[in-house]
């Protein structure tokens, strides 16, 4: 047990105010009542506490709320949020978007990606799903934060909010996240015309299956190389040279620049060299003419 601390009578704290900045660490420990601190959390951010003093205040709150802080406290954490670890945040139950906004503002300019990701996760859990209001808050206050959510959390996104997602919001999304978001986007944009549909679906295509890419190749979409490079390797490999040519349109020349990078490199290795030669780009590494391609995976599946 920690050595018992007694507050000197002249140092007793009856309210959280600026006088506390003159308290030594031990005095803060002994004299600040955690419940009083919790009740007056809204005052803390206006007081220029040192980092060491903020540590004491955090320990006070941890001691009072071992199962995680209530939202009334979380909402007013201010710069004390910078002291929180993902483990601390994982204990929270947050439902208010005002709380989320306040803490996202505080975290700006600080290396807190893990904490922010955990906070967003707790908000989604607290609200039951990633609803439109939450998504709007994320896009406004934390572009790219959508991608900090796990695929499991993203699965709760209703297709109706996909339209509010901007391309830059998906920049940091990984393949597993796009796998979840793509079908929702496809559903959300299904009634749009060809060119309009492609503009909307483009940022989500990292989750598209081969069949959908084949279908797009029939629509003269002229996919840019940056989008093509973000496609799933498994989805690109089965595409024929003709399908890729149609898919990229005038951008097909970019394949030469990317021929050493996945998924282009892997796709080249799967194509017949004479088919690649029809592109006139000098792409090398295809299957030499006269070679027979045995797809052993199909044979294994049949046996």
């Amino acid at each position: 047990d920690v050595e018992r601390t007694t507050c000197p009578p002249e140092k007793e704290v009856h309210e959280i105010d600026e006088s506390l900045i003159f308290y030594k660490k031990r005095e803060l420990e002994a004299c600040v009542d955690a419940a009083l601190l919790a009740a007056q959390m809204d005052r803390v951010d206006a007081i220029p506490f040192t980092y060491e003093q903020l540590d004491v205040l955090k320990h006070k709150l941890d001691e009072l709320y071992p199962q995680g802080y209530p939202e009334s406290v979380i909402r007013h954490l201010g710069h004390l949020f910078l002291k929180m670890s993902p483990e601390d945040i994982r204990k929270w139950n947050v439902t208010s978007l005002e709380t989320l906004k306040a803490l996202l503002k505080v975290s700006k300019g600080h290396e807190m990606s893990a904490q922010v990701a955990t906070l967003i996760d707790r908000v989604v859990v607290g609200r039951g799903q990633l609803d439109k209001d939450t998504a709007d808050t994320l896009t406004a206050f934390c572009p790219g934060c959508l991608c900090s959510l796990s695929p499991e959390r993203l699965s709760s996104v209703p297709p109706s909010i996909i339209g509010a997602v901007r391309p830059q919001d998906l920049d940091t999304c990984g393949p597993r996240q796009l796998d979840v978001l793509y079908p929702k986007a496809r559903l959300a944009f299904q009634n749009m015309s060809g060119s309009e549909y492609f503009v909307k679906i483009r940022p989500f295509l990292g989750g598209a299956p081969t069949e959908d890419l084949k279908a797009l190749s029939q629509q003269n979409v002229s996919m840019d190389l940056a989008t093509f490079m973000k496609l799933r390797r498994e989805a690109v490999l089965p595409l024929s040279v003709a399908e890729v040519q149609k898919l990229l349109g005038p951008h097909v020349e970019g394949l030469k620049v990317e021929e050493q990078h996945s998924p282009v490199r892997d796709w080249i290795l799967k194509q017949r060299q004479d088919d690649l030669d029809t592109l006139g780009l000098g792409l090398q590494g295809g299957i030499p003419n006269g070679y027979l391609i045995l797809d052993l995976s199909v044979r294994e599946a049949l046996s």
């Epitope: 601390t5 002994a30 009542d33 955690a34 009740a39 320990h59 006070k60 071992p66 009334s72």
Partner: antibody, heavy 119, light 108 residues
Framework: EVQLLESGGGLVQPGGSLRLSCAAS????????MSWVRQAPGKGLEWVSA????????NYADSVKGRFTISRDNNKNTLYLQMNSLRAEDTAVYYC????????????WGQGTLVTVSS | EIVLTQSPGTLSLSPGERATLSCRAS???????LAWYQQKPGQAPRLLIY???SRATGIPDRFSGSGSGTDFTLTISRLEPEDFAVYYC?????????FGQGTKVEIK
């Protein structure tokens, strides 16, 4: 099931000392703020003292400050109240109570132990 | 310290009637830190209401709390025989915790 069991009460002369104990079970004592509350015969409730779980930070009512000391042994899940310089007006049933920070209230109470200060 | 004054001191009512108990604070109390307790003779107090209006576990819905600032109320919508007891309000921020002097609800 949360249980708080006070002991150590009895008859003591004015100026004397007594140590009350409260054995806690059924919850994580090491995470919990604890309090002592007393009730003089036929009177209302009076909060006496409180202690935090880890730092053992203490607070007292003015009426007992300097005479009573609250402490805890987290290894034994036990809360104590050391009462010195006892006065007739300290005669009361002393209750040990658990403070629930999430409710900001004393949500579990012991059955109390009677302290009588008399010559 | 915050002084809590309860009124009336005694309330004489019959089973089935509505009881309204008042608790007034000498200065503003955050509703999050206002609680009500019930105590029967020879027993320890029991938490009824916390946060001014939330019922504690196992407390029947005939008990309700309301109020903010300096005025708080405990209401028992229909008195049952087991409700005749003494009721205390309490504030828990800041220290010292203080209790009201109690309201006795007795059978008329």
């Amino acid at each position: 099931e949360v249980q708080l069991l006070e002991s150590g009460g009895g008859l003591v002369q004015p100026g004397g000392s007594l140590r009350l104990s409260c054995a806690a079970s059924g919850f994580t004592f090491t995470h919990t703020y604890m309090s002592w509350v007393r009730q003089a015969p036929g009177k209302g409730l009076e909060w006496v003292s409180a202690i935090s779980p880890t730092y053992s930070t203490t607070n007292y009512a003015d009426s007992v400050k300097g005479r009573f000391t609250i402490s805890r042994d987290n290894n034994k899940n036990t809360l104590y109240l050391q009462m010195n310089s006892l006065r007739a007006e300290d005669t009361a049933v002393y209750y040990c109570a658990r403070y629930n920070a999430y409710h900001a209230a004393l949500d579990y109470w012991g059955q109390g132990t009677l302290v009588t200060v008399s010559s | 310290e915050i002084v809590l004054t309860q009124s009336p001191g005694t309330l004489s009512l019959s089973p089935g009637e509505r009881a309204t108990l008042s608790c007034r604070a000498s200065q503003s109390v955050s509703s999050s830190y206002l609680a009500w307790y019930q105590q029967k003779p020879g027993q320890a107090p029991r938490l009824l209401i916390y946060g001014a209006s939330s019922r504690a576990t196992g407390i029947p819905d005939r008990f309700s709390g309301s109020g903010s600032g300096t005025d708080f109320t405990l209401t028992i919508s229909r008195l049952e025989p087991e409700d005749f007891a003494v009721y205390y309000c309490q504030q828990t921020v800041p220290y010292p915790y203080t209790f009201g002097q109690g309201t006795k609800v007795e059978i008329k």
